[in-house]
Interface confidence: medium
């Protein structure tokens, strides 16, 4: 079927990096400069993505595959083949429509990406707070109150209505 | 691939609990959060709580608290989630789905295929 | 506690174009993702942050906002995209829940 479809199909016999050229009777001709082809018998070669702005290259354009790029410094990937770069925020915050927004109450993020978490609820385990949370900290939860000993101390959480948890996650 | 393979359909009466088992396979179990999720017949869908599977913290919607509880079992790669003193208004499907947040964007991107719990006398 | 609102039912044309549109405080701060089902099976995302299509989800499905609500767009609706469709975001309300989902839109393709 190969040798038929070939025989009928001159392009099909054009590697990758090359394209089925019809100004030239159907020769495989090299993809020009700044392109490429990633398959056989391709009659045109695909135009390289150019990494520019808060793009950078990852991987260079060549003949048989295209370049690949992520984010300059500051900036992090979004979607399919890093379509789009999006800031940093900082520990801390999120980003949101607006940019960059400090965790609400309630909430943390301990990284530079990623959205604000809801603080750990201790009593949900039976146990107290011996750390309270920050925007960038989990609370750090200790032994149940029943197990602490006499004039041991613990954090008091916080009041009900802005128990951990209870905020945006 | 990624896959969250929930338990059977159960059929509970008023007053008892269920307990539904959620299996995940195809990624590293303890980096996303796993949120449950129902729907009575008809409705949309209703957000119930989220488990840490690392750490095994949980958060859930005030009108659940009291009345549900999700663990997990990381040597199983499963989260559980159960809800005691069923009402018929309980009935729904329910389904876990994975929290992938794509660095800063919220999103279930992977849910179970669903669990019927009809809760009738 | 905050909600997101969506008209129940959307029609439209085979081949045309239409919006989905979702409504809520939280949408101001977050966006919104969204979802289809089709009978008897699970909610499947289609878009998510500032117009970002899972793989798999074809370019006819696209997300944009305004002010305090974000927009699905089919554009060159299929019969197949018959469903019903619900956005999502997190909540900004200091109390329960977390996570909030709209009523759902069921759309029709003439």
């Known amino acids: 079927f190969e040798r038929t479809r070939s025989l009928q199909d001159p392009c099909s016999n054009c590697p990758a990096g090359t394209f089925c050229d019809n100004n030239r009777n159907q020769i495989c001709s090299p993809c020009p400069p700044n392109s490429f082809s990633s398959a056989g018998g391709q009659r045109t070669c695909d135009i390289c993505r150019q990494c520019k702005g808060v793009f950078r290259t990852r991987k260079e354009c060549s003949s048989t595959s295209n370049a690949e790029c992520d984010c300059t410094p500051g900036f992090h990937c979004l979607g399919a083949g890093c379509s789009m770069c999006e800031q940093d925020c900082k520990q801390g915050q999120e980003l949101t429509k607006k940019g960059c927004k400090d965790c609400c109450f309630g909430t943390f993020n301990d990284q530079k990406r990623g959205i604000c978490r809801p603080w750990t609820n201790c009593s949900l385990d039976g146990k107290s707070v011996l750390v309270n949370g920050t925007k960038e900290r989990d609370v750090v939860c200790g032994p149940s109150p029943a197990d602490l000993s006499p004039g041991a101390s613990s954090v008091t959480p916080p009041a009900p209505a802005r128990e951990p948890g209870h905020s945006p996650q | 691939q990624v896959q969250l393979v929930q338990s059977g359909a159960e059929v509970k009466k008023p007053g008892a609990s269920v307990k539904v088992s959620c299996k995940a396979s195809?990624?590293?179990?303890?980096?996303?959060?796993m949120h449950w999720v129902r729907q009575a017949p008809g409705q949309g869908p209703e957000w119930m709580g989220v488990?840490?599977?690392?750490?095994?913290?949980?958060t859930y919607a005030q009108k659940f608290q009291g009345r549900l509880t999700v663990t997990r079992d990381t040597s199983s790669s499963t989260v559980y989630m159960e809800l005691s003193s069923l009402r018929s208004e309980d009935t729904a499907v329910y389904y876990c789905?994975?929290?992938?947040?794509?660095?800063?964007?919220?999103?279930?991107?992977?849910w179970g295929q669903g669990t019927t719990v009809t809760v009738s006398s | 506690s905050s909600e997101l609102t969506q008209d129940p039912a959307v029609s439209v044309a085979l081949g045309q174009t239409v919006r989905i549109t979702c409504q809520g405080d939280?949408?101001?701060?977050?966006?919104a993702s969204w979802y289809q089902q089709k009978p008897g099976q699970a909610p499947r995302l289609l878009i998510y942050?500032?117009?970002i299509r899972p793989s798999g989800i074809p370019d006819r499905f696209s997300g944009t906002d305004s002010g305090n609500t974000d927009f699905l767009t089919i554009t060159g609706a299929q019969a197949e995209d018959e469903a019903d469709y619900y956005c999502?975001?997190?909540?900004?309300?200091?109390?329960?829940?977390?996570?909030?989902f709209g009523g759902g839109t069921k759309l029709t393709v003439l």
């Open positions: 999502n975001s997190r909540d900004t309300d200091a109390n329960q829940p977390l996570v909030l």
């Open positions: 488990i840490n599977p690392s750490s095994g913290g949980t």
């Open positions: 939280s949408l101001r701060r977050y966006y």
């Open positions: 789905a994975r929290d992938d947040v794509f660095d800063y964007y919220f999103g279930l991107d992977v």
């Open positions: 195809g990624y590293t179990f303890t980096s996303k959060w």
């Open positions: 942050g500032k117009n």
